[in-house]
Interface confidence: medium
């Protein structure tokens, strides 16, 4: 069974996947299909880097372009540096412009 078939088999379990498990899978030669990726919790996807999403999706990463206006892809794009998004070569727009300071508001809230 290949990586894609795994995700067809287990996509019903993935809705509650925590970020840590998604990061682990990104290191383990898996190709998640876009339909499954779109079902993930937005708060679990947001902390993933461009490189991690690229490795998690494998050849399916090209499908991000078709989903760039939909959650969780839209919200994830807004959290990435535009430079990093450009490395995918998909024409994704809406990332943080070069030179802008990125504030981790979740950390700020935790400290206040």
């Amino acid at each position: 069974m290949n990586g894609s078939e795994y995700f067809v088999k287990i996509q019903s379990f993935l809705g509650g996947a925590p970020t840590e498990d998604l990061k682990a899978l990104s290191q383990q030669n898996v190709s998640m299909d876009l339909a499954t990726f779109m079902k993930l919790r937005t708060d679990a996807v947001l902390p993933l880097t461009v490189a991690e999403v690229q490795k998690l999706l494998g050849p399916h990463v090209e499908g991000l372009k078709a989903e760039e206006r939909h959650r969780p892809v839209r919200d994830w794009i807004l959290r990435q540096r535009q430079d990093d998004l450009d490395t995918l070569g998909l024409g994704l727009q809406g990332g943080i412009p070069n030179g802008y300071l990125v504030l981790d508001l979740s950390m700020q809230e935790a400290l206040s």
Partner: antibody, heavy 116, light 111 residues
Framework: EVKFEESGGGLVQPGGSMKLSCVAS????????MNWVRQSPEKGLEWVAQ??????????HYAESVKGRFSISRDDSKSSVYLQMNNLRAEDTGIYYC???????WGQGTTLTVSS | DIVLTQSPASLALSPGKRATISCRAS??????????IHWFQQKPGQPPKLLIY???NLETGVPARFSGSGSRTDFTLTIDPVEEDDVAIYYC?????????FGGGTKLEIK
């Protein structure tokens, strides 16, 4: 082609220190977790340490047997991972391998001997 | 820690026969449905070489004589048919939880 060049092994006395280095090529080093694994006739293959990515603040994890004595680090600009080993014991003797991700690629290994 | 118990410790087979190696985990090694058990082959003087990842996926370049099966806690590496070149020690690895752990190894000899 993925390649690793490990160095730093040798003979050291109990209580001594040693630093191992592993220089990688052939893949985007900064995107992958890196591990050190060791092998001895007594213990077989034993995972030693792991370092994650810059986006994870270079989080590190260690086997219980080396916690507080070993320190893993990486330099993404040099595609290198290191293992600083202090207060070495006889049971640390073995072949030390660096490996990428979940073991898709391994170095040839460098031998550490801890003996008086 | 997750303990991986491999059996048998060694086996000797004639060329053309089927080799079956078991790896049993002390708890589930599934990450949201993906079984993160990997099989390695190690020949004398060489580092381990990845054969199978995620319990059943054949690594690129590995002959189709090698296959993996199982889920959750019970996994099997099968070599069918065995060839002279398969003389080695075979290990399983779990990457589900820190510390990552290896099985004790199975030595395959050819009669």
């Amino acid at each position: 082609e993925v390649k690793f060049e490990e160095s730093g092994g040798g003979l050291v006395q109990p209580g001594g220190s040693m630093k191992l280095s592993c220089v990688a090529s052939g893949f985007t080093f900064s995107n992958y977790w890196m591990n050190w694994v060791r092998q001895s006739p007594e213990k077989g293959l034993e995972w030693v340490a792991q370092i994650r990515l810059k986006s994870d603040n270079y989080a590190t994890h260690y086997a219980e047997s080396v916690k507080g004595r070993f320190s893993i680090s990486r330099d993404d600009s040099k595609s290198s991972v290191y293992l600083q080993m202090n207060n070495l014991r006889a049971e640390d003797t073995g072949i030390y391998y660096c490996s990428v991700g979940t073991g898709g690629y391994w170095g040839q290994g460098t031998t550490l001997t801890v003996s008086s | 820690d997750i303990v991986l118990t491999q059996s048998p410790a060694s086996l000797a087979l004639s060329p053309g026969k089927r080799a079956t190696i078991s790896c049993r985990a002390s708890e589930s090694v599934s990450i949201i449905g993906t079984d993160v058990i990997h099989w390695f082959q190690q020949k004398p003087g060489q580092p381990p070489k990845l054969l199978i990842y995620h319990a059943s996926n054949l690594e690129t370049g590995v002959p189709a004589r090698f296959s993996g099966s199982g889920s959750r806690t019970d996994f099997t590496l099968t070599i069918d048919p065995v060839e002279e070149d398969d003389v080695a020690i075979y290990y399983c690895l779990q990457s589900r939880k820190i510390p990552w752990t290896f099985g004790g190894g199975t030595k395959l000899e050819i009669k």
